[in-house]
């Protein structure tokens, strides 16, 4: 019979770290409705690709400084007469000297420095949310060439590929989330608890899953990162003829619990609780929160049916969770 | 109502291996823990294992590291334990229990197998 | 390893008394710690959870108590049905239990 919960503990994880993940169940296709939000490809999950932005600067860099056509004479005052013909093609100017790359890295440095400096007084907050793992890494043989002294200047690199090229700040990339509802009716018998699974993705507008771990046959989502999950439930709930028909008792109440690996008293969970002598014969019962999940735990709905009659929650009740971040 | 029947007294040689089994009713099986227990002839309770039948998770004592080994199959609802190597050590009666979910304490006990 | 203690491995009482049993960890258990009754015949059951908690069906004579690493069953009028042996057991880190306590009638 249901038992009312401890406290749950606030010190590091008891549990052991769990093996491999396993296999994707029949239950685990990734496949989905176009209706959901698509994978943002690499392109666009970083405003510039570094190596690109270079080579396009490579490739420009016969324009400017370095522009064939350059006049190596003085500048010429404008005359404001009318035009003449044109004359003839003039001779084959000698070739300008090719500025070495090193050069024209430095003069890069220079342009993105200064657009740094312009951003940074149009943004006094820097942004910390890109990601600046796979740019720092494909920067790295560039700002090997620079001079040691230029560390600032290639940090400063760094943060403009990192962060988006429009001002303003921007969301982080949503790594792993999902929204899934109850297929079918669960019957949950009186002084029971029930974890609920057989779970469907909705092919619906809005909808949702990114990133491994849901299991939608065993209804349990097994955290793809450590990190912060905002975790949320709402089930529909139907009341059950009571024995011997006698109204719901006072003392009568269900729990609608979000645990970590199935342990909702020694390890934190999500907790919602509701009084049943008022309640109607159909109601909503709903628990949201935060819960910190190692990689690899995971965590699913149950509810504690701690009353004297028998109740069914209802198909399209559902389970949901975002990383928030780590 | 929740019932742990586990299976009968098993009389072995030392040196063999024992498979001991323990069917769950009257729950579903698969949202929760079930740890294996040692008792020794008049002596105390000993914590072997636990297994968790939905991803087939275990943890072991250490002392019981390469001498137990637990399994589950969902489809008949039953845990297993196989002692190897057996020794006049291992002559003890042996438990199953479930693990609350909201308690996490052992609410429900095997009536424990003799070997 | 945490190491549970329970000092008194036999208690002799009379129907009516009250009863005290205790269990000493070798460390903070944070509370962590659950009582068993095993009766004469080899059955287990659960009393009490997480400390203090009364376990569905046991009658309200049971009690518990402690913090830390020290932890007592109070039975508080004995009854003959109460003639069993209880064990501690703390979830805190792994899973370890007393070594017991066998309470008789005088």
């Known amino acids: 019979s249901p038992e009312p919960g401890a406290p749950s503990r606030s010190r590091a994880r008891r549990e052991p770290p769990p093996g491999n993940e396993l296999p994707r169940g029949p239950g685990e296709s990734r496949a989905g409705p176009a209706a959901r939000p698509p994978e943002p490809t690499a392109e666009r999950a970083h405003s510039v690709d570094p190596r690109d932005a270079w080579m396009l600067f490579v490739r420009q860099s016969d324009k400017g400084v370095n522009g064939k056509k350059r006049s190596r004479g003085k500048a010429k005052k404008l005359k404001f007469g009318l035009p003449g013909p044109p004359g003839p093609p003039g001779p084959q100017g000698p070739p300008g000297p090719i500025i070495p790359p090193e050069a024209l890295l430095k003069e890069f440095q220079l342009l993105l420095k200064g657009a740094v400096r312009q951003r940074e007084r149009a943004e006094p907050e820097p942004c910390t949310c890109g990601p600046a793992g796979p740019v720092a890494a494909s920067l790295a043989p560039v700002s090997a060439t620079a001079g040691e002294d230029d560390d600032d200047v290639v940090g400063d690199v760094l943060a403009l590929l990192a962060a988006p090229l429009a001002p303003g700040p921007r969301a982080p990339r949503v790594e792993a989330a999902f929204l899934c509802r109850l297929r079918r009716d669960a019957l949950v018998e009186r002084r029971a608890l029930h974890e609920l699974g057989v779970y469907y993705l909705p092919d619906a507008e809005g909808a949702f899953r990114r990133g491994p771990g849901l299991n939608l046959t065993s209804g349990q989502y097994r955290a793809p990162v450590a990190g912060f999950y905002a975790l949320a439930a709402t089930l529909h709930v139907a009341l059950g003829e009571p024995p011997r028909r006698g109204p719901p008792r006072p003392r009568d109440h269900l729990r609608l619990l979000i645990c970590i690996q199935s342990r909702c008293q020694r390890n934190a969970s999500l907790e919602a609780i509701m009084g049943l002598e008022s309640s109607s014969e159909l109601f909503t019962i709903s628990v949201n929160g935060v819960l910190y999940l190692q990689m690899g735990q995971w965590t699913s709905v149950f509810l504690d049916n701690a009353s004297g009659c028998s109740l069914t929650v209802r198909s399209g009740s559902h389970f949901s969770a975002v990383l928030l971040g780590v | 109502q929740v019932q742990l029947q586990q299976s009968g007294p098993e009389l072995v040689k030392p040196g063999a291996s024992v498979r001991i089994s323990c069917k769950a009713s009257?729950?579903?099986?698969?949202?929760?823990?079930i740890h294996w227990v040692k008792q020794r002839p008049g002596q105390g309770l000993e914590w072997i294992a636990w297994?968790?039948?939905?991803?087939?998770?275990?943890e072991y004592n250490e002392k019981f590291k390469g001498k137990a080994t637990l399994t589950a199959d969902e489809s008949s609802s039953t845990a297993y334990m196989q002692l190897s190597s057996l020794t006049s050590e291992d002559s003890a009666v042996f438990f199953c229990?479930?693990?609350?979910?909201?308690?996490?304490?052992?609410?429900?006990w095997g009536q424990g197998t003799s070997v | 390893d945490i190491q549970m203690t329970q000092t008194t491995s036999s208690l002799s009482a009379s129907l009516g008394d009250r009863v005290t049993i205790s269990c000493r960890a070798s460390?903070?258990?944070?509370?962590?710690l659950n009582w068993y009754q095993q009766k004469p015949d080899g059955t287990v059951k659960l009393l009490i959870y997480?400390?203090?908690r009364l376990y569905s069906g046991v009658p309200s004579r049971f009690s518990g108590n402690g913090s830390g690493s020290d932890y007592s069953l109070t039975i508080s009028n004995l009854e003959q049905e109460d003639i069993a042996t209880y064990f501690c057991?703390?979830?805190?880190?792994?899973?370890?239990f007393g070594g017991g306590t066998k309470l008789e009638i005088k």
């Open positions: 009257g729950y579903t099986f698969t949202s929760y823990y």
């Open positions: 297994i968790y039948p939905g991803n087939v998770n275990t």
């Open positions: 229990a479930r693990e609350g979910i909201t308690t996490n304490a052992l609410d429900y």
């Open positions: 460390q903070d258990i944070s509370n962590y």
């Open positions: 057991q703390q979830g805190h880190t792994l899973w370890t």
């Open positions: 997480y400390t203090s």
